[in-house]
């Protein structure tokens, strides 16, 4: 609807209730560190009712925690930007008005991140075919909590071999992580010739491990159009 | 119908001020939050700043807070945004906008006044 | 902040395909995310609210769909007038981002 904002007939006085109890139902909140939080209550009522929050069934301070929060009353909402431990604990707000009072309890953990080796997320790259003269994309997901380095690298031949000399395969680097590099998720190929078929991999890599998931790019001659489907959800399957 | 006219965009100076309107009709003003947007040449979308109808709650852009406030006159049903210590960067058009009750989705836009901050 | 990640960040298409945009934040928002077209010269229109919702006024071949990291708008059948750029945006934290946009070209 264009306009969703109800005003209470004055004459209708009520006690608070809760207009979305779909936004209540997680009452656990497991954040990781650094993570900005929310907790809300959607209340009406008639009056309007007023909001307030209690950490662990005290009056939630400004002071209580490093930086404050946030509240935004059109929103019925608390706010905690960069959570850290110490924010552990049970937020309960109360919705008021003189008929009436409601609330509702959010337990709230903070989960201080482990360091592990790159997530890339299943199915990606995912394996695509174009015309010659096309273009392709290629997407990585990468889950890491360290400042991970993407490599987009590809299998070349030297002088008609794939192989060296010491049996390991010839790479080139395509694309990689850096200050000169957007979006380094993500390979764009344009204007494809038959050479640029093969294998592409996403190579990534933080302080603990690395990991590493590859594609195949396959390029029909001008004649042979590939199905849509394939071309336009780039990979998002 | 909701209508929102921005105004007060022009060419100044690096350092120079420059104070945006947005006068609003069609809707109880004081009932919604308002939000400033702005879009640079060629580049995408960046949220400025946000005000609540009563104006209790305040958020600004981490690139304009301690340079621009923001600021609304419920009875004259008029926006503002005081933009002070003006940078090259800060070019682009301004667009106010009307937050979605009980949301934060932009549903009614103005049409835009360009900024243009240079020597 | 958080950090919204769209892509692709073009795409060439014909006039009754299935086009999808995904839109990737870079923390659990829940579902405080929107959907809006901009066309060149134009103020961006919204066309999904919520990560699902439809806005008023909008055609049902639009649809959004996800919640948590991961988001998706979907066109069913691409329209001539649906050629302009798509951006996401997030309102989960009190620093809204949006993504760099998504533009949708004829093929």
């Known amino acids: 609807m264009a306009e969703d904002f109800v005003s209470e007939n004055s004459n209708n006085k009520r006690a608070p209730y809760w207009t979305n109890t779909e936004k209540m139902e997680k009452r656990l909140h497991a954040v990781p560190a650094a993570n900005t939080v929310k907790f809300r209550c959607p209340a009406g009522g008639n009056p309007m009712p007023t909001m307030r929050w209690l950490k662990n069934g005290k009056e939630f301070k400004q002071e209580h925690r490093i930086g404050g929060y946030k509240v935004r009353n059109q929103h019925w909402s608390l706010i905690m930007e960069s959570v850290v431990p110490s924010d552990k604990g049970n937020y309960t707000c109360v919705v008021e008005n003189e008929y009436g009072s409601i609330n509702h309890t959010y337990h709230l953990d903070v989960v201080e991140r482990s360091p592990h080796r790159p997530i890339l997320q299943a199915g990606l790259p995912a394996n695509a075919s174009t015309v010659v003269g096309g273009d392709v994309e290629f997407v990585c997901k990468v889950y890491s909590d360290a400042q991970p380095h993407i490599q987009w690298i590809k299998h070349v031949e030297k002088n008609g071999s794939k192989y060296g000399p010491d049996g390991l395969p010839y790479l080139k680097v395509l694309k990689h992580s850096g200050i000169n590099s957007s979006n380094a998720e993500v390979l764009a190929l344009f204007n494809v010739t038959e050479a640029d078929a093969g294998e592409y991999i996403c190579k990534v890599s933080n302080y603990i491990g690395q990991a590493n998931q590859s594609a195949w790019l396959t390029v029909l001659p001008k004649q042979q159009a590939p199905g849509r489907e394939k071309e336009h959800h780039h990979h998002h399957h | 119908q909701v209508q929102l006219l921005e105004s007060g965009g022009g060419l100044v100076q690096p350092g120079g001020s420059l104070r945006l309107s947005c006068a609003a009709s069609g809707f109880t003003f004081s009932d919604y939050a308002m939000s400033w947007v702005r879009q640079a040449p060629g580049k995408g979308l960046e949220w400025v700043s946000t005000?609540?109808?009563?104006?209790?709650?305040?958020e600004y852009a981490d690139s304009v807070k301690g340079r621009f406030t923001i600021s609304r006159d419920n009875s004259k049903n008029t926006l503002y945004l005081q933009m002070n210590s003006l940078r090259a960067e800060d070019t682009a058009v301004y667009y106010c906008?009307?937050?979605?009750?009980?949301?934060?989705?932009?549903?009614?836009w103005g049409q835009g006044t360009l900024v243009t901050v240079s020597s | 902040d958080i950090q919204m990640t769209q892509s692709p960040s073009s795409l060439s298409a014909s006039v009754g395909d299935r086009v999808t945009i995904t839109c990737r934040a870079s923390q659990d928002i829940s579902s405080d995310l929107n959907w809006y077209q901009q066309k060149p010269g134009k103020a961006p229109k919204l066309l999904i609210y919520?990560?699902?919702n439809l806005q008023s006024g909008v055609p049902s071949r639009f649809s959004g769909s996800g919640s948590g990291t991961d988001f998706t708008l979907t066109i069913s059948s691409l329209q001539p007038e649906d050629f302009a750029t798509y951006y996401c945006?997030?309102?989960?934290?009190?620093?809204?981002?949006f993504g760099q946009g998504t533009k949708v070209e004829i093929k």
């Open positions: 906008a009307r937050e979605r009750t009980y949301s934060s989705a932009f549903d009614y």
């Open positions: 005000i609540e109808g009563d104006s209790n709650y305040i």
């Open positions: 919520d990560a699902s």
């Open positions: 945006h997030q309102w989960y934290s009190t620093l809204y981002t």
